[in-house]
């Protein structure tokens, strides 16, 4: 009679994470008497996967009634596969004795696990940056297998080219991670913009995963200031307005100074939003000209989003102001933009 052979017909098996893997094994003879065991890996450090008679293997079931005397099929099913289960599995026949001794091993079946990448997480810089500056965004995704993966960056649907990507580890592993850093140049119109990281993998069946970052969390658009004088509202009163335009985010504090002395401080509240997502705001100051003997320097000072204050001044010439009701007030906008 021919010597017993252990046949593992599948050289490799590929299974999606979460599914069950069936590992086939048959023997060609009932002799010698002795159990079958399954191991992952070879050598002294091999891991016991299934023993017919002893041990706890809650994820393993036999495909056929392996304890029946005439049974020659020792295939097993392993449930709820994870990337950690990848490896080469050996079906091993033992000869009964004291102790049982290894008689013959199958050629092995390599189990590879297809695992989906986690949803990409995109993170931007810790501090806001202003238009024309270049900022870095990172994208991370973990837990995928096999190693091959494609990552692309987009800004508002336009593919970016300035990025660097690493897949770790470099060598063999049960699962992998990807890390990519993209450089993005900000523009004043980027408040509504999005940066998108797109990951494509064999497990996603052509439906890539996307992670996004809103540039509204990254950009700071500093305001432009314009101070203008309005017609006289009443006798000896001049209305001066400070137009604060195109700023983002909304956090803004405005201070009026009369000849360098603080007159009023207020916080932007009822702002108007522009189409590009930036804000406009207007503040006005009513100046009693008759209370001033000399010319008045009015300064609109704005502190935006915790940044150093910017200011614009306007010179109000009191000497040119006639005391008669209804006459025009002479004023001059110096146009200075002090920091």
């Amino acid at each position: 009679e021919e010597e017993l052979q252990v046949i593992q017909p599948d050289k490799s098996v590929s299974v999606a994470a979460g599914e069950s893997a069936i590992l086939h094994c048959t023997v060609t003879s009932l002799i010698p008497v002795g159990p079958i065991q399954w191991f992952r890996g070879a050598g002294p450090a091999r891991e016991l996967i299934y023993n017919q008679k002893e041990g706890h293997f809650p994820r393993v079931t036999t495909v056929s009634e392996s304890t029946k005397r005439e049974n020659m099929d020792f295939s097993i099913s392993i449930s709820n596969i994870t990337p950690a289960d990848a490896g080469t599995y050996y079906c091993v026949k033992f000869r009964k004795g004291s102790p049982d001794t290894e008689f013959k091993s199958g050629a092995g079946t390599e189990l590879s696990v297809r695992a989906k990448p986690s949803a990409p997480v995109v993170s931007g810089p810790a501090a806001r940056a202003t238009p024309q500056h270049t900022v870095s965004f990172t994208c991370e995704s973990h837990g995928f297998s096999p190693r091959d993966i494609t990552l692309k960056w987009f800004k508002n649907g336009n593919e970016l080219s300035d990025f660097q990507t690493n897949v770790d580890p470099v060598g063999e592993s049960v699962s992998y991670s990807i890390h990519s850093t993209a450089k993005v140049v900000l523009t004043r119109e980027d408040v509504h913009s999005q940066v998108i990281c797109e990951v494509a993998h064999v497990t996603l069946q052509g439906d890539p995963l996307r992670g996004t970052a809103n540039l509204s969390e990254t950009i700071r658009v500093p305001p432009t200031l314009e101070v203008t004088q309005q017609p006289v509202r009443a006798e000896n009163q001049v209305n001066v307005t400070c137009q604060v335009r195109k700023f983002y985010p909304q956090r803004l504090q405005l201070t009026w100074l009369e000849n360098g002395n603080v007159s009023r401080t207020e916080t932007a509240s009822t702002v108007t939003e522009n189409k590009d997502g930036t804000y406009n705001w207007m503040s006005w100051l009513l100046v009693n000209v008759s209370a001033h003997r000399d010319d008045v320097k009015l300064t609109c000072q704005v502190e935006h989003d915790g940044q150093p204050a910017v200011s614009k001044s306007h010179d109000l010439k009191v000497s040119a102001h006639p005391k008669e009701q209804g006459s025009n007030t002479a004023a001059e906008n110096t146009g200075s933009n002090e920091r």
Epitope: K53, E54, G55, H56, F57, T67, R69, P99
Partner: antibody, heavy 114, light 108 residues
Framework: EVQLQQSGAELVKPGASVKLSCTAS????????MHWVKQRPDQGLEWIGR????????KYNPKFQDKATITVDTSSNTAYLQLSSLTSEDTAVYYC???????WGQGTTLTVSS | QIVLIQSPAIMSASPGERVTLTCRAS???????LYWYQQKPGSSPKLWIY???NLASGVPARFSGSGSGTSYSLTISSMEAEDAASYFC?????????FGGGTKLEIK
């Protein structure tokens, strides 16, 4: 539901023999080994031996080789532990354990006393 | 035969405390064959950890197991009153199968 039902407590005289039983239900009795484990009062666990119900093959702890005999009756899904030449040292709780080590009987208390 | 030595033999821990029980083998044991059991007075032992690091069904996640070769351990990340029990390590790597002497864990 897997169950291992052990026989009741025994009080026997020194020098006598006793046969403890363990009846299995809820699984294929011949699938896995059946082990017997000894636990003396407030002490650790000692493995006595095991049997393969499929063919009656046994393995024993050398310490119990001359003390214990493990047998099975597959028709009644029952494993037996026979202990001979009893002494006070044999006073203990005896557990039958399925080969997966998950399922344990409730234990049989054996008291050896004159 | 492989002798398993558990330490400490007895210990007490406060609720919330991290607890580590050790089991040393007189010769190397493959990690697949090292199991732990929990036993409370008047009850049969319960399989608690199998294959060194896998928690048996129903075992709280605060338990973990680790080790290789001749050195193994069971750890409770945050002791709770219900964890007070005796714990036994066990090898079935070679005959005769053996158990450690046990660690009795008490709550302070």
């Amino acid at each position: 539901e897997v169950q291992l039902q052990q026989s009741g407590a025994e009080l026997v005289k020194p020098g006598a023999s006793v046969k403890l039983s363990c009846t299995a239900s809820g699984f294929n009795f011949e699938d896995t080994y059946m082990h017997w484990v000894k636990q003396r009062p407030d002490q650790g666990l000692e493995w006595i031996g095991r049997i393969d119900p499929a063919d009656g093959d046994t393995k024993y702890n050398p310490k119990f080789q001359d003390k214990a005999t493990i047998t099975v009756d597959t028709s009644s899904n029952t494993a037996y532990l026979q202990l001979s030449s009893l002494t006070s040292e044999d006073t203990a709780v005896y557990y039958c354990v399925r080969g997966n080590y998950v399922n344990w009987g409730q234990g049989t208390t054996l008291t050896v006393s004159s | 035969q492989i002798v398993l030595i558990q330490s400490p033999a007895i210990m007490s821990a406060s609720p919330g405390e991290r607890v580590t029980l050790t089991c040393r083998a007189s010769s190397s044991v493959s990690s697949s064959y090292l199991y732990w059991y929990q036993q409370k007075p008047g009850s049969s032992p319960k399989l608690w950890i199998y294959s060194t690091s896998n928690l048996a069904s129903g075992v709280p996640a605060r338990f973990s197991g680790s080790g290789s070769g001749t050195s193994y351990s069971l750890t409770i990340s945050s002791m709770e009153a219900e964890d007070a029990a005796s714990y036994f390590c066990h090898q079935w790597y070679s005959y005769p199968r053996t158990f450690g002497g046990g660690t009795k864990l008490e709550i302070k």
